[in-house]
């Protein structure tokens, strides 16, 4: 059990388009047909103005027009809802499909893709119906852009809502070696297939992926709770033969200075097929990207019932060490290390300024007033309503 780890099934609160917790000033667009179809009129179920946001330009064939929502803080966005133009019930404009892009810092934008690499999302079939789309995988974002699409020159308009929860973990990115394929009777693909950073020279850096999506793997790593995915999907894995050093090294970057109580790593231990819990973990800490690693590393040897083949969460105490960057080495105790999730229990250090504050000056990282202090990474604190009770695989997904 990943004690205290966020549950993606419960992270489905409306984030504030419909109920106006997201102010007009945080909604913008590439263009608008007129002031009455400006970005601020893009709230789900709203009939403001002419009933939706409508771009000035055609979305065919270029697909360059977008509606942008700034959530002001990092959120896990698990679900989106779209509608067409209301116009007193006379509107005929809607978007049959769209793409999403998202950013955590306002500088680097990523395309949302589903688990099979598809970017295009099925949208609306009429102007009034709300179509909900489960985002599998969910995205960790501060800014989200909707790019409506069309298959011919036509008018498209959008109203939207986003659903999710505050990203309390504070994890901005992790860096890790590329996951590898295990060759059994069939190939088991242990790559991080939803990683949204860069991949170069055997290293993935600057992004988040399956190790931070809230989904823990099964005891048998060849199987998955996801439908229609390949063997090994839930896990990221590395062969000890690939690491002369005897360990896999990962680095974690956080939004601000935090006091780290523990790291939880969900590991596979199907030792009959070579997967073993790490023999130990060693973590180093530093406060800034160019600063020296501080003090002695925290070392934790793993005991417990290593013969039990069940997957489990391993808790690594971090002793309240203060840092914004962690580098952890996971020691091989067998042929393979397989992780499905890594999360952190931490508290924001009082008055620490956000790492990315000022990267786009008009909007502070935190809402006006002092940032919350000493919150646990486990709270949800929904911004809007109750969770939307739709699950992946529902007819609207």
């Amino acid at each position: 059990d990943m004690k205290g780890h966020f549950d993606p099934a419960k992270c489905r609160y409306a984030l504030g388009m419909q109920d106006r917790t997201i102010p007009d000033s945080d909604i913008s667009a590439s263009s608008s047909w007129s002031d009455s179809t400006a970005a601020r009129h893009s709230r789900l179920e709203s009939s403001d103005g002419d009933g939706a946001w409508c771009p000035a330009g055609s979305v065919f064939p270029k697909e360059e027009e977008y509606l942008q929502v700034d959530l002001q803080r990092l959120h896990l966005v698990a679900l989106v809802g779209t509608q067409g133009r209301h116009a007193g019930g006379l509107g005929k404009e809607f978007s049959r499909s769209y793409r999403l892009r998202y950013s955590r810092d306002g500088r680097r934008w990523m395309d949302w893709k589903d688990r099979w690499g598809q970017e295009v999302i099925s949208g609306n079939e009429d102007p009034e119906g709300v179509v909900l789309k489960d985002l599998g995988p969910p995205m960790v974002a501060r800014l989200v852009r909707f790019y409506p699409r069309a298959d011919r020159v036509m008018s498209v308009c959008l109203r939207v809502e986003l659903y999710g929860c505050l990203w309390r973990d504070g994890l901005l990115s992790y860096t890790a070696p590329v996951g590898q394929t295990m060759y059994l009777s069939e190939a088991v693909y242990l790559n991080d297939s939803t990683y949204d950073g860069h991949t170069m020279g055997g290293l993935q850096y600057g992004g988040l992926g399956q190790l931070a999506d809230g989904v823990v793997g099964l005891d048998d790593f060849r199987k998955s709770q996801e439908l229609r995915v390949w063997p090994g999907y839930d896990y990221v894995g590395w062969s000890n033969h690939s690491f002369s050093s005897g360990y896999v090294e990962m680095e974690f970057e956080f939004d601000r200075l935090r006091a780290f109580q523990a790291m939880q790593v969900h590991c596979n231990n199907m030792h009959t097929l070579g997967a073993r819990l790490p023999g130990g973990v060693e973590c180093r800490f530093r406060r800034g990207p160019a600063m020296a690693w501080e003090g002695e590393p925290m070392r934790h040897n793993l005991g417990g019932n290593l013969g039990d083949p069940r997957a489990r969460a391993v808790s690594v105490p971090l002793g309240g060490r203060v840092a914004r960057f962690l580098q952890c080495r996971f020691l091989f105790a067998g042929p393979w290390l397989l992780f499905s999730e890594i999360s952190f229990i931490s508290d924001v250090v009082n008055n620490s300024s956000p790492a990315l504050g000022g990267t786009f000056p008009p909007a502070p990282w935190w809402p006006p007033g002092p940032p919350p202090t000493n919150f646990s990474s486990l709270e949800l604190e929904p911004r809007g309503q109750q969770p939307v009770a739709k699950a992946e695989g529902s007819p609207t997904a």
């Epitope: 242990l190 991949t199 055997g202 033969h241 690939s242 690491f243 002369s244």
Partner: antibody, heavy 121, light 107 residues
Amino acid sequence: QVQLVESGGRVVQPGRSLRLSCTASGFSLNRYYMLWVRQAPGKGLEWIGTISYGDTTYYASWAKGRFTISRDNSKNTLYLQMNSLRAEDTAVYYCARADTGDNGYLGLQLWGQGTLVTVSS
Amino acid sequence: DIQMTQSPSSVSASVGDRVTITCQASQSIGSVLAWYQQKPGKAPKLLISGVFDLASGVPSRFSGSGSGTDFTLTISSLQPEDFATYYCQYIPYGSSPFGGGTKVEIK
């Protein structure tokens, strides 16, 4: 254009030192594991050493102590410092970049053209 | 240190022949093996990484197999441009020894 260009190879007397350079263009050296490999005339490929993106170095047992790999990120250049050179160090020296294939395993996907070092009195 | 041993050191074959080259590691290396082709006066060219994975642009007549300590490179139907020397390499994040090479010559 993504490429590696070695330089610094020449005729050198036994016992002397020599530094080879490998300049990268089209990518950042510090994002990759970089290797030096050599090939004596008419012989096979011989791994000399590797530098990781974290600047950890690994050497073949025969190269430890005499050969040193380093890099200058500002110049995007990899170096091989060779000391106490011997006749048997005569070879073409290559630098190469390690990348992962679709299955996550490394291979040397990019090589320089090589530079010839001749150790002779 | 791990040693890589290739056999045969040379093989004579004709166009259209099936050619098999083997590589043996002194201890288990899992699937951490790459194969290269080198022609005289040229730098080596990556053919396969991770035992099986063909590098971009490599023809499908090349294939790799094996795991642990014993590995094979197969050319299913030798073409004129395939006459060259082939090397295996254990290539982890760290030490990376090559095999001694196998020269494929025209019969």
